[in-house]
């Protein structure tokens, strides 16, 4: 028969970062190639990446679509050489990937801090908000825009001439802390997702921007919310 | 000065759909705030049904949260409550409000700050 | 979900009294996302207090507020006439946001 020479796909994984989501697996293929399927518990199989000798596949156009939705695939192996019109009848060997649900899975990239502002002895922090592949009528939607107020800030902050670290919390993507007059100070940020109880609750930390540079007197403006 | 009015039917038959609408007038729902809606029981406390930001992101009380879609329409400035498969427990005044973004601890919080009157939602057949 | 508790049910007072009003978290909440609300017969909530401490635009400065971790306090120094009323705590921190049942402030 025409899959007698082919070995299933295994170790399935999905590797997924601010919903840009691509599945991968094994082995490497020998004179074989592999197609991916992909649906929603209750919907139909849609096959993506035909007859691909890579061991990955880029599922995002599929699951932005829903990003709270809860995902399977599954990866089919054909022998090199395949094509649909064959005739053969018998399934060819596959495998299953884990459950995947893009919202609560998704790991958090690395932000960016996008502007600081001393007036005085405050400073105006601002977290660059994070273009993704998830749209809304026709939009692409931010990060804030998909995970709300399920999407916090951590900043760490702290004299350039000392180590002491102080630590500030937002729900939106800005800050706004108190220094000490004539003192530069050096910040990073994380983004976390409080109600996450797993691994990928925060993001790693963002490059160190430190005042005195060019980032701090740029004035670039961001996403700015009305605060009271 | 943003304002909120809730509109929708005052009475709504058992094991029907609850739908309220809620108008922003003097600022617009796009503008980086959340949009709530509450409901007190007749002469009870208050109760968080749910909320929405202007992107569609929403976030539902899990009490309630198989019969309950929020939705938002930009282009009118307005957002809606839908609730399912209502009961005589359902009764209640309906509240929509705003949720904006106060500075506290070094940060941005958001709380209630701007409600509307209420309207007076009955489930009797 | 978080319960909050609030004490006593019914504070009965006279006009130029202090009224000191608690709020108890059956878990702790992070002083951020507690808030007081002032809710008068027929009408809408009206937000107080934001951040456990901090007033609101336009609220007089014998409305203040205290407290951290799972103990919370409303206190208005000199009741005045217009402060009989519900008073309700919230917070904002976990999903789903929740309500104290309410303290009724009553005139004496």
């Known amino acids: 028969s025409g899959t007698t020479n082919t070995v299933a796909a295994y170790n399935l994984t999905w590797k997924s970062t601010n919903f840009k989501t691509i599945l991968e697996w094994e082995p490497k293929p020998i004179n074989q190639v592999y197609t991916v399927q992909i649906s929603t518990k209750s919907g139909d199989w849609k096959s993506k990446c035909f007859y691909t000798a890579d061991t990955e596949c880029d599922l995002t156009d599929e699951i932005v679509k829903d990003v709270k939705q809860t995902y399977l695939a599954r990866v089919f192996s054909y022998p090199a050489g395949h094509v649909e019109s064959t005739g053969s009848t018998e399934e060819p060997p596959y495998e299953n990937s884990p459950e995947f649900t893009p919202y609560l899975e998704t790991n958090l990239g690395q932000p960016t801090i996008q502007s600081f502002e001393q007036v005085g002895t405050k400073v105006n922090v601002t977290v660059q908000d994070e273009w993704t592949l998830v749209r809304r009528n026709d939009t692409f939607l931010s990060l804030r825009d998909v995970f709300g107020k399920d999407l916090i800030y951590t900043l760490y902050y702290w004299k350039s001439s000392s180590s002491g670290k102080k630590t500030a919390k937002t729900n939106t993507n800005e800050f706004l802390i108190d220094v000490d007059k004539g003192e530069n100070y050096c910040f990073s940020v994380q983004a976390v997702i409080p109600s996450r109880r797993t691994a990928n609750r925060k993001s790693t930390d963002s490059p160190v921007e430190c005042m005195g540079h060019e980032k701090g007197e740029s004035r670039e403006t961001g996403h700015h919310h009305h605060h009271h | 000065q943003v304002q909120l009015q809730e509109s929708g039917p005052g009475l709504v038959k058992p094991s029907q759909t609850l739908s309220l609408t809620c108008t922003v007038s003097g600022g617009s729902i796009s503008s980086g705030q959340y949009w709530s809606w509450i409901r007190q029981h007749p002469g009870k406390g208050l109760e968080w049904i749910g909320e929405?930001?202007?992107?569609?992101?929403?976030r539902y009380n899990p009490s309630l949260k198989s019969r309950v879609t929020i939705s938002v329409d930009t282009s009118k400035n307005q957002f809606s409550l839908k609730l399912s498969s209502v009961t005589a427990a359902d009764t209640a005044v309906y509240y929509c409000?705003?949720?904006?973004?106060?500075?506290?601890?070094?940060?941005?919080?958001?709380?209630?700050?701007?409600w509307g009157k209420g309207t007076t939602v009955t489930v009797s057949s | 979900e978080i319960v909050l508790t609030q004490s006593p049910g019914t504070l009965s007072l006279s006009p130029g009294e202090r009224a000191t009003l608690s709020c108890r978290a059956s878990?702790?909440?992070?002083?951020?996302?507690l808030a007081w609300y002032q809710q008068k017969p027929g009408q809408a909530p009206r937000l107080l207090i934001y951040?456990?401490?901090s007033r609101a635009t336009g609220i007089p400065d014998r409305f203040s507020g205290s407290g951290s971790g799972t103990d919370f306090t409303l206190t208005i120094s000199r009741l005045e006439p217009e402060d009989f009323a519900v008073y309700y705590c919230?917070?904002?921190?976990?999903?789903?946001?929740?309500f104290g049942g309410g303290t009724k402030v009553e005139i004496k």
């Open positions: 878990q702790s909440v992070s002083s951020s996302y």
């Open positions: 929405i930001y202007y992107s569609g992101s929403t």
């Open positions: 409000a705003r949720d904006a973004p106060y500075y506290y601890g070094g940060g941005y919080y958001y709380y209630m700050d701007v």
């Open positions: 919230q917070q904002v921190g976990v999903v789903p946001y929740t």
């Open positions: 951040g456990a401490s």
